[in-house]
Amino acid sequence: EVEKTACPSGKKAREIDESLIFYKKWELEACVDAALLATQMDRVNAIPFTYEQLDVLKHKLDELYPQGYPESVIQHLGYLFLKMSPEDIRKWNVTSLETLKALLEVNKGHEMSPQVATLIDRFVKGRGQLDKDTLDTLTAFYPGYLCSLSPEELSSVPPSSIWAVRPQDLDTCDPRQLDVLYPKARLAFQNMNGSEYFVKIQSFLGGAPTEDLKALSQQNVSMDLATFMKLRTDAVLPLTVAEVQKLLGPHVEGLKAEERHRPVRDWILRQRQDDLDTLGLGLQGGIPNGYLVLDLSMQEALS
């Protein structure tokens, strides 16, 4: 706690300017009026204050706004935002996308901090859903943002927002998240023609069910192996050799290099060896000719 000392004669700040850089911490506390600071917050970011000086300025704002800062101040916090705790941020009511952008800009290039996560959470909850403009903004600053949300949180993403999602935004998503996002993407892109549809839906296919993969196999899409390897194993297993061949097109040759990895390994185990042989890739591990295939999952369901 900075001691309450009187401001020395002639040092009372009339405006927030660079002369304050040379004030000691106690002089800043004594000579800078909190209301003046609040109205000239946009200047603070342009002045190279030390971290210790920023602590004093934050303290003054905290005293002026014990219930939380108004948005007019929040928008111009600049580097002072880095001094805020998640507890401070929970008191805010941030409604403007411009305010959100201004604060994300301060943290640009760094990992998502607890402060930023709290800010985003407050903002999204205030809006009620992750609209397209918000998603656009968040994924521009944090490409992995979408994959940091729980399936429950993702359920609030409207299909229209899916247009803002780029392939790299989904790189770290797990199957549970893609399960939620895929139906939204399917709905968002439903009016596109075959090839255009596939380009857009490709990143989301980790959440696609078997029937959708079967439908895609009829459209000459030529899925690459990287996409195929991200498909749900349970969605791939029921596909026939002919369907996988159609789905992958010229990329089918890549199966050989992936034969020991899921889902290819598990899919091979479910195929007849003579069907696999028709691919001419030397894939081994299929069901030998003459063996009966029992669907154990069906048998368990019946018993």
């Epitope: 002639g10 040092k11 660079e18 002369s19 850089i21 040379f22 946009d42 200047r43 342009a46 002045i47 190279p48």
Partner: antibody, heavy 116, light 110 residues
Framework: EVQLLESGGGLVQPGGSLRLSCAAS????????MSWVRQAPGKGLEWVSG????????YYADSVRGRFTVSRDNSKNTLYLQMNSLRAEDTAVYYC?????????WGQGTLVTVSS | QSVLTQPPSASGTPGQRVTISCTGS????????VSWYQQLPGTAPKLLIY???KRPSGVPDRFSGSKSGTSASLAISGLRSEDEADYYC???????????FGGGTKVTVL
């Protein structure tokens, strides 16, 4: 009204010395950092030196470091620039300016000519 | 060779908009505020823009400044004959422990 008035310029031989002064008025001189900026004939602006209110740290451009010394007397509201070992390339109009990170007021300048 | 890079000249007819760029690096413009100075022929420089985009009192709102990343720009809208001058950008550079200027841009009103 803020006023800055430089003096002390003139003709000097290479290797010689000069001391420039800048008398300030219209603001609380002791609260503000001050700077010197120069401009060679027909050329652009070049920052020379800066000094904080308490003279604690002093800042210099590489081109003058070790030859020029900035100082101030807050009781006289005056800024100084002691220039030693002068070279032909130091020929310029020398301006004093208020502040160190953004110069909001400038003097009219004093001409320093270094020539034999 | 100036640390900040400006175009040597710019021109326009009366009423036009002229923009001057100023390019620096992460150690100057990228981390500190930019100022713009106007120097009319035969006079001392005058502060035109400070803290990236603020105008001192008395500077017409025809002059505006902005900064993005490691670059800044000065725009003069509704160009007038009295705007014919040299314009300099400047910023503090902590890596040099000093202030750096651009080489200056001569604005001509055609």
């Amino acid at each position: 009204e803020v006023q800055l008035l430089e003096s002390g310029g003139g003709l000097v031989q290479p290797g010689g010395s000069l001391r420039l002064s800048c008398a300030a008025s219209g603001f609380t001189f002791s609260n503000y950092a001050m700077s010197w900026v120069r401009q060679a004939p027909g050329k652009g602006l070049e920052w020379v030196s800066g000094i904080p209110p308490d003279s604690g740290s002093k800042y210099y451009a590489d081109s003058v470091r070790g030859r020029f010394t900035v100082s101030r007397d807050n009781s006289k509201n005056t800024l100084y620039l002691q220039m030693n070992s002068l070279r032909a390339e130091d020929t310029a109009v020398y301006y004093c300016a208020k502040n160190m990170f953004s110069f909001d007021y400038w003097g009219q300048g004093t001409l320093v000519t270094v020539s034999s | 060779q100036s640390v900040l890079t400006q175009p040597p000249s710019a021109s326009g007819t009366p009423g036009q908009r002229v923009t001057i760029s100023c390019t620096g690096s992460s150690s100057n413009i990228g981390s500190n505020a930019v100022s713009w100075y106007q120097q009319l022929p035969g006079t001392a420089p005058k502060l035109l823009i400070y803290y990236n985009s603020k105008r001192p009192s008395g500077v017409p709102d025809r002059f505006s400044g902005s900064k993005s990343g490691t670059s800044a720009s000065l725009a003069i809208s509704g160009l007038r004959s009295e705007d014919e001058a040299d314009y300099y950008c400047g910023s503090w550079d902590p890596s040099l422990n000093g202030y750096v200027f651009g080489g200056g841009t001569k604005v001509t009103v055609l």
